[in-house]
């Protein structure tokens, strides 16, 4: 006897006569001379249990065959698939008045699974079944089973189960297979929501609304719903679920992010590689851990690289004027990978004899534009005490400085108020200009106000407009500025320093480097 057969996923078989081992044992009425259970051989000489009747010689046949009780398993509509062979009445001798070529299909709902007798009046007719083809002996002779297949449905059903019955009215027929099934929309996952096996509705046009549940490691975005159609197909998916943070969709599931990857939010995005200077060591990371010495600010997105505090500002210049000090500096060489760099000024008042004995300047000192959070690289400090040593620290800070403050992030200068600095240098000359260098010379300030300790040359490309300058210090009154770019305009300033501090810068000297070497003697005017 053939074993279980494979049917579509949206069909649930309640009865399959071909899968029954041994005799079917259905109830026939009359017990003799009507339907008879007969073994036939299929093409592979495998026995198949069939029910046959061929009472074609007598009129007014009324032969009934009833199945065993069939549970409906909650189905409201069931389908009956009948595979049968019907013999052409013309192929049977002398039976033209009595032979028929149809049979009738009936059903009876019952909660009783052990009804022993067929009561015809209890049964409701489903349909009259006619063959699409009827066969003569010629058709059957080749041993290949030629079957008609008819499917009928019945519903709505309400009792625990039902019986089917076949009424023969004088045909020559073999029921080769009777299969009863209902349709369901099979368990499925759509938009990361799982929808359970759902039995179709009672009507052939009904839609059953089903709420889905989010798959593991996901959460609802919009309430997931689908409709189970009468044919067992899912229709109109609405809403969806999103994989939780640390998970991404793969084949309808939410899989944990692999090591080295992360996902910060419940979105439909995939896991992303950890940003620069960060790592993850576990699967399912929602963020990546910063490398040693690197940090993430509170308001940094998980997708941003980890950064570090900046290095110290460069080229700090001070200019003392009685009880005021002007400080100027350049941006740090390393910003730590961040754009949010700012500067804080720390003012310390130090003892004359012991510079290590310093204390905060206090609230009487004023800073322009401000003391902390400076975006520019200069500050004016006023209302200092006269004849006092001050140390000023310029701290470069960014969004992660607080996680790792270090002296390496600051530069300092010590000045004494109320000591006269040298006057400005009146004349700066370009003695020689080449493609890559300028030789400068200048005169001592008119009023040195003491021993000049050194001169400071500040220069920058003209079109940089002092945003990025360089400093060269020398004890002589001349210097060669090397490493310049050809055919580029540079601006030079020079000032002197004594023990009292720096004087003012000279007026700017503008020099353009050559393409061909030549000697130019400047007189303080712009040289080209």
């Amino acid at each position: 006897v053939t074993g279980s057969r494979v049917y579509p996923a949206n069909e649930v078989t309640l009865l399959d006569s071909r899968s029954v081992q041994g005799e079917l044992g259905w109830i026939a009425s009359p017990l003799e001379g009507g339907w008879e259970e007969v073994s036939i051989m299929d093409e592979k000489n495998t026995p198949i249990r069939t029910y046959q009747v061929c009472n074609v010689m007598e009129a007014s046949q009324n032969n009934w065959l009833r199945t065993d009780w069939i549970t409906r398993e909650g189905a409201q509509r069931v389908y009956i698939e009948i595979k049968f062979t019907l013999r052409d009445c013309n192929s049977l001798p002398g039976v033209m008045g009595t032979c028929k070529e149809t049979f009738n299909l009936y059903y009876y709902e019952s909660d009783n699974d052990k009804e022993r007798f067929i009561r015809e009046s209890q049964f409701g007719k489903i349909d009259t079944i006619a063959a699409d083809e009827s066969f003569t002996q010629v058709d059957i002779g080749d041993r290949i089973m030629k079957l008609n297949t008819e499917i009928r449905d019945v519903g709505p059903l309400s009792k625990k189960g039902f019986y089917l019955a076949f009424q023969d009215v004088g045909a020559c027929i073999a029921l080769v297979s009777v299969r009863v099934f209902y349709k369901k929309c099979p368990l499925t996952v759509r938009n990361l929501a799982q929808f359970p096996d759902t039995i179709t509705g009672a009507d052939t046009s009904s839609l059953v609304e089903v709420r889905g549940s989010c798959v593991n490691n996901s959460e609802e975005k919009d309430v997931p719903k689908m409709y189970c159609g009468a044919d067992g197909e899912w229709l109109v998916p609405i809403g969806n679920c999103l994989c939780n943070a640390g998970h991404e969709e793969q084949n309808g599931e939410c899989q944990a992010c692999k090591i080295g990857y992360y996902k910060a939010l419940s979105t439909d995005a995939s896991c992303a590689k950890c940003p620069p200077h960060s790592y993850s060591v576990w699967e399912g990371a929602t963020s990546c851990t910063c490398d040693r010495g690197f940090f993430r600010a509170d308001n940094d997105a998980a997708s941003m690289p980890c950064t570090r505090p900046p290095s110290a500002p460069l080229n700090l210049i001070s200019n003392v004027n009685e009880t005021s000090v002007n400080l100027e500096w350049s941006s740090p060489q390393n910003t730590g990978g961040r754009q949010d760099i700012s500067y804080n000024v720390v003012c310390k008042k130090c003892g004359a004899g012991d510079p290590s004995k310093c204390r905060p300047c206090g609230s009487g000192v004023h800073y322009t534009p401000q003391q902390n959070g400076l975006k520019t690289t200069r500050v004016s400090i006023t209302d200092l005490l006269a004849h006092t040593n001050y140390t000023f620290e310029i701290w470069a800070v960014n969004g992660v400085s607080k996680y790792n403050p270090s002296p390496d992030q600051s530069v300092s200068v010590t000045v004494t108020t109320n000591q006269a600095a040298p006057s400005s240098i009146a004349l700066v000359q370009a003695k020689e200009v080449t493609r890559y260098s300028v030789a400068l010379a200048w005169l001592e300030p008119d009023r040195p106000n003491g021993v000049i300790l050194e001169y400071e040359v500040k220069y920058y490309e003209k079109d940089q407009n002092e945003r990025s300058y360089r400093i060269v210090r020398t004890a002589a009154r001349n210097t060669d500025i090397k490493g310049l770019n050809p055919l580029t305009s540079y601006v030079f300033h020079v000032r002197a320093r004594t023990a009292a501090g720096y004087g003012d810068f000279s007026e700017p000297l503008e020099v353009t480097t050559n393409t061909v070497p030549s000697r130019i003697i400047g007189d303080g005017a712009n040289s080209t």
Epitope: E32, G33, M41, Q52, C54, M57, E58, R87, Q137, M145
Partner: antibody, heavy 121, light 106 residues
């Protein structure tokens, strides 16, 4: 159970007639055709023909027309084979057999025990 | 009239062996033959009809196949009670029997 009961052996002289009865039981007599089959001593089976028990319409095989007549008495569920002008070569066992029509083919599914008719002078 | 020829006339087999009986029609027939078994002193018994249907109570070691003019009855493993004469029979407008094959103990 379904049975076909035939009469005992008959000994007849050449030229005589014989009527062999076949009484059916255990099923509706008029629902199945009845066939007649002859088997001469030591020989194989020969199909003689059949009769539609519902209409009484007979069909005879080649070689069995004229002297052979199939008839019925449905009131007693009995089929008859009558052979007239018996010849020595008619000596044989005569079987009645119920015809089974099915979707997949026909056959004779229930047989009588046979009636031996001996024709001898 | 269609003539059915059975072969061999006698087939000697041992119990448990496979037996294959042939039935050849003189012309192509529209249907597969029925097969009968007859033991000495008994009426014939229907085995298989329409080439695909076992008669009531017939074990499935008996099977039939073929089409057109050549047909076969196969006994997969011969049992002691299977030794008998076997006839094929063609049905249609006129029915005819083959002359029979005797299956005897080897």
């Amino acid at each position: 159970q379904v049975q076909l009961l035939q009469s005992g052996a008959e000994v007849k002289k050449p030229g005589a007639s014989v009527k062999v009865p076949c009484k059916a039981s255990g099923y509706t007599f008029t629902s199945r055709a009845m066939s007649w089959v002859r088997q001469a001593p030591g020989q194989g089976l020969e199909w003689m023909g059949w009769i539609n028990t519902n209409t009484g319409n007979p069909t005879y095989a080649q070689g069995f027309t004229g002297r052979f007549v199939f008839s019925l008495d449905t009131s007693v569920s009995t089929a008859y084979l009558q052979i007239s002008s018996l010849k020595a070569e008619d000596t044989a066992v005569y079987y009645c057999a119920r015809v089974r029509f099915t979707v997949y083919g026909d056959g004779m599914d229930v047989w009588g025990q046979g009636t031996l008719v001996t024709v001898s002078s | 009239e269609i003539v059915l020829t059975q072969s061999p006339a006698t087939l000697s087999v041992s119990p448990g062996e496979r037996a294959t009986l042939s039935c050849r029609a003189s012309q192509s027939v529209s249907s597969n033959p029925a097969w009968y078994q007859q033991k000495p002193g008994q009426a014939p018994r229907l085995l298989i009809y329409g080439a695909s249907t076992w008669a009531t109570g017939i074990p499935d070691r008996f099977s039939a196949s073929g089409s057109g003019t050549d047909f076969t009855l196969t006994i997969s493993r011969v049992e002691p009670e299977d030794f008998a004469v076997y006839y094929c029979q063609q049905y249609g407008p006129s029915w005819t029997f083959g002359q029979g094959t005797k299956v005897e103990i080897k």
